[in-house]
């Protein structure tokens, strides 16, 4: 699906680092790990917890309607940022020279709207507003509308 232009027209300005070195588990309690090629994320039940990915979350302000919480997700101790590619497409890890201070236009594939409800965390893509960061059993982290994919995460 093509990126949604309304959100893409917004300018997202870096506010602050709001969460550091946290782990995300899906509703099957799968952990997220980095694929061998380092460009993608996958889920499984890990025995070796050293493989599990730790994330940093950066808050942004849109300057427009402040009713949402725009964030970027970065792999801790790296410059790899989670990026949206479209429906049923795996999220891509983009290497950036630094944490973006301003995100506009086509770069909004880096922005996700974070919402915590029911003790669960959801991430909707700014570029594809109908899609959530999602998981399935032992498969790549991707974007989906909902079931059969799982769209909620526990953060710890």
């Amino acid at each position: 699906s093509a990126p949604y232009t309304y959100q893409s027209d917004l300018r997202y300005k870096l506010m602050k680092l709001v969460r550091q070195k946290f782990v995300m588990n899906d509703s099957l309690n799968q952990t997220i790990y980095q694929d061998v090629d380092k460009h993608y994320l996958s889920t499984t039940w890990l025995n070796d917890l050293q493989q599990e990915v730790k994330f940093d979350m950066y808050a942004y302000s849109s300057g427009g309607d402040d009713s949402k919480y725009p964030v970027t997700l970065k792999i801790s101790d790296s410059q790899l940022f989670v990026s949206a590619q479209g429906e049923d497409q795996p999220v891509l890890l983009k290497e950036l020279p630094e944490t973006p201070k301003l995100i506009t236009g086509s770069e909004t594939d880096l922005i996700f709207f974070w919402k915590s409800i029911n003790s669960k965390n959801y991430f909707t893509s700014a570029a594809y507003p109908e899609l959530f960061i999602a998981t399935k059993e032992q498969s790549r982290v991707h974007l989906a509308r909902g079931l059969p994919s799982m769209t909620d995460f526990q953060i710890s």
Epitope: D65, D66, S67, S116, I117, T124, E130
Partner: antibody, heavy 115, light 107 residues
Framework: QVILKESGPGILQPSQTLSLTCSFS??????????VNWIRQPSGKGLEWLAQ???????LYNPFLKSRITLSEDTSNSQVFLKITSVDTEDSATYYC???????WGLGTSVTVSS | SIVMTQTPKFLLVSAGDRVTITCKAS??????VAWYQQMPGQSPKLLIY???NRYTGVPDRFTGSGYGTDFTFTISTVQAEDLAVYFC?????????FGGGTKLEIK
């Protein structure tokens, strides 16, 4: 466990200022992504969202009432305050506070504006 | 402001009936719609969020669906304790707005 509780004057006269307090526990407004909403409901009628105050002093207002509303907070005491100036009988309602995503609500406080 | 038009206003049903309430947004609100139940003399209680996600502890007879501008809330088999007013609400953009409510009465 998240708990919210509203308190207010009960009865006041037209043209006065309504002052309401929402005392809450189980979360902190200094945490990114948290907020408190104010919603009101005239007796037997629907729900009207009034305003929201959140972390980083984010404030959202219903434009219909923005000129009359003031929002403030006391983060250390986990309290949020709503002031509505120049009240009229149409401001008579049950006033609720709820957390940011409106999954937890207080029991409400009844406000009557009468001369 | 986004207007949420909720229909019907009243529903008189028998226990065991299937009930459907609709909400139409004046512009797209993506999936940012919640449904609340308000029992007499109580504060609203969240049943459904993100249009179709059931809140913890909510019986599976309550379901929600929709995206964009058209949303549906269904009670598959109404029970006597479902006597309440039901509201839809959008939190896509400020000011957040509610539908006018549907009063469910049991015959």
């Amino acid at each position: 466990q998240v708990i919210l509780k509203e308190s207010g004057p009960g009865i006041l006269q037209p043209s006065q200022t309504l002052s309401l307090t929402c005392s809450f526990s189980g979360f902190s407004l200094s945490t990114y992504g948290t907020a408190v909403n104010w919603i009101r409901q005239p007796s037997g009628k629907g729900l009207e969202w009034l305003a929201q105050i959140g972390s980083d002093d984010r404030k959202l207002y219903n434009p219909f009432l923005k000129s009359r509303i003031t929002l403030s907070e006391d983060t250390s005491n986990s309290q949020v305050f709503l002031k509505i100036t120049s009240v009229d009988t149409e401001d008579s309602a049950t006033y609720y506070c709820a957390n940011g995503v409106m999954e937890y609500w207080g029991l409400g406080t009844s406000v009557t504006v009468s001369s | 402001s986004i207007v949420m038009t909720q229909t019907p206003k009243f529903l008189l049903v028998s226990a065991g009936d299937r009930v459907t309430i609709t909400c139409k947004a004046s512009q797209s609100v993506n999936h940012d719609v919640a449904w609340y139940q308000q029992m007499p003399g109580q504060s609203p209680k969240l049943l459904i969020y993100f249009a179709s996600n059931r809140y913890t502890g909510v019986p599976d007879r309550f379901t929600g669906s929709g995206y964009g501008t058209d949303f549906t809330f269904t009670i598959s088999t109404v029970q006597a304790e479902d006597l309440a007013v039901y509201f839809c609400q959008q939190d896509y953009s400020s000011p957040y707005t509610f539908g006018g409510g549907t009063k469910l009465e049991i015959k």
